[in-house]
Interface confidence: medium
């Protein structure tokens, strides 16, 4: 039975040209995290594998930095980066948990951040 839950940074906004941290946290389960995939729609951004480390997609490696933790830092943001991002936690024995983050990249110089939390 899958008992875990994914907490995410929720809906967030950031300034064009700036950077943002995409962060998810899996809680309420003792399942082992074997891999976390970060995807935008159906496109791979990055993978963090427990045994193999980080793999950044060719499409993003010039402006994606791994971390902090299992999170992902997007740099040099453009308006085209606006959209849904998914953290997909592969765990054993529970299976797959998915979290959703919506990022809005704003042209203006004032970008209000949405829900935020600290990852312990």
């Amino acid at each position: 039975m899958m008992t875990g839950t994914i907490e995410t940074t929720g809906n967030i906004s950031a300034e064009k040209g700036g950077s943002i941290i995409l962060q998810c946290h899996l809680s309420s389960t003792t399942a082992q995290v074997t891999q976390v995939n970060w995807e935008q729609q159906d496109q791979l951004l990055a993978i963090c594998n427990a045994d193999l480390g980080w793999h950044i997609s060719p499409s993003f490696k010039d402006r994606v930095a791994p971390g902090p933790g299992l999170g992902l830092t997007l740099q040099s943001l453009t308006v085209n980066d606006t959209g849904e991002y998914f953290c997909i936690y592969h765990t054993y024995p529970d299976g797959t948990y998915t979290g959703r983050i919506f990022l809005e990249v704003l042209e203006s110089s004032v970008a209000e951040h949405g829900a935020r939390f600290q990852i312990p």
Epitope: Q35, N37, Q43, I47, N49, L52, G53, H55, P58, S59
Partner: antibody, heavy 120, light 107 residues
């Protein structure tokens, strides 16, 4: 030594599906993506997609997305590529190749190729 | 998708000649370029990765250079066993794409 051994030649009718296998040996199966590339007669190379055997994560060329499925069997270190709704222009040699998980992306070992002929 | 344009499509040179193949990307690919050799009826073989790094076991007569959108592959002294088709391959952005190939023949 590293080997990628592919299944034998196939002849299919238009509209049918084909499933090509690629059996890996001589290295740690989960540490490398398996790539699929095809080559029509007398033509160049076209990337179809990739799968990471450890997790089953797969990413496809948009040109094939609706017709291709990649799967793996970790117990036999085998990857499968299934292409559906075949048409005559899918006649090609289909290659699997491995790409190391990490930051440099290159296909350092290739299978021998599988000729798929689509003809009525 | 990034288009890779290779030139020439074919060439004929004498043993010992210096051979140069160029590959132009439709947008900057940041040195994320590989070169493969393919002989008739065989799978491609990796020669050069990341623009200029020689893959293990590949003879030093093969080399690569370039930046931005323009890349060059060189055989410093053509040998009979180099008869093959050569492909460039970009991995800057998915989908991975290849040049259309350059067929190298001996005069």
């Amino acid at each position: 030594q590293v080997q990628l051994v592919q299944s034998g030649a196939e002849v299919k009718k238009p509209g049918a599906s084909v499933k090509v296998s690629c059996k890996a040996s001589g290295y740690t199966f989960s540490n490398y993506w398996i790539e699929w590339v095809r080559q029509a007669p007398g033509q160049g190379l076209e990337w179809i997609g990739e799968i990471l055997p450890g997790s089953g994560s797969s990413y496809y060329n948009e040109n094939f997305k609706d017709r291709v499925t990649m799967t793996r069997d970790t117990s036999t270190s085998t990857v499968y590529m299934e292409l559906s709704s075949l048409r005559s222009e899918d006649t090609a040699v289909y290659y699997c190749a491995r790409q190391k998980y990490g930051n440099f992306y290159y296909f350092d070992f290739w299978g021998q190729g599988t000729l798929v002929t689509v003809s009525s | 998708a990034i288009q890779m344009t290779q030139s020439p499509s074919s060439l004929s040179a004498s043993v010992g000649d210096r051979v140069t193949i160029t590959c132009r990307a439709s947008q900057g690919i940041g040195n994320y370029l590989n070169w493969y050799q393919q002989k008739p009826g065989k799978a491609p073989k990796l020669l050069i990765y990341y623009t200029s790094s020689l893959h293990s076991g590949v003879p030093s007569r093969f080399s690569g250079s370039g930046s931005g959108t323009d890349y060059t592959f060189t055989i410093s002294s053509l040998q009979p066993e180099d008869i093959a088709t050569y492909y460039c391959h970009q991995y800057s952005k998915l989908p991975y794409t290849f040049g259309q190939g350059t067929k190298v023949e001996i005069k």
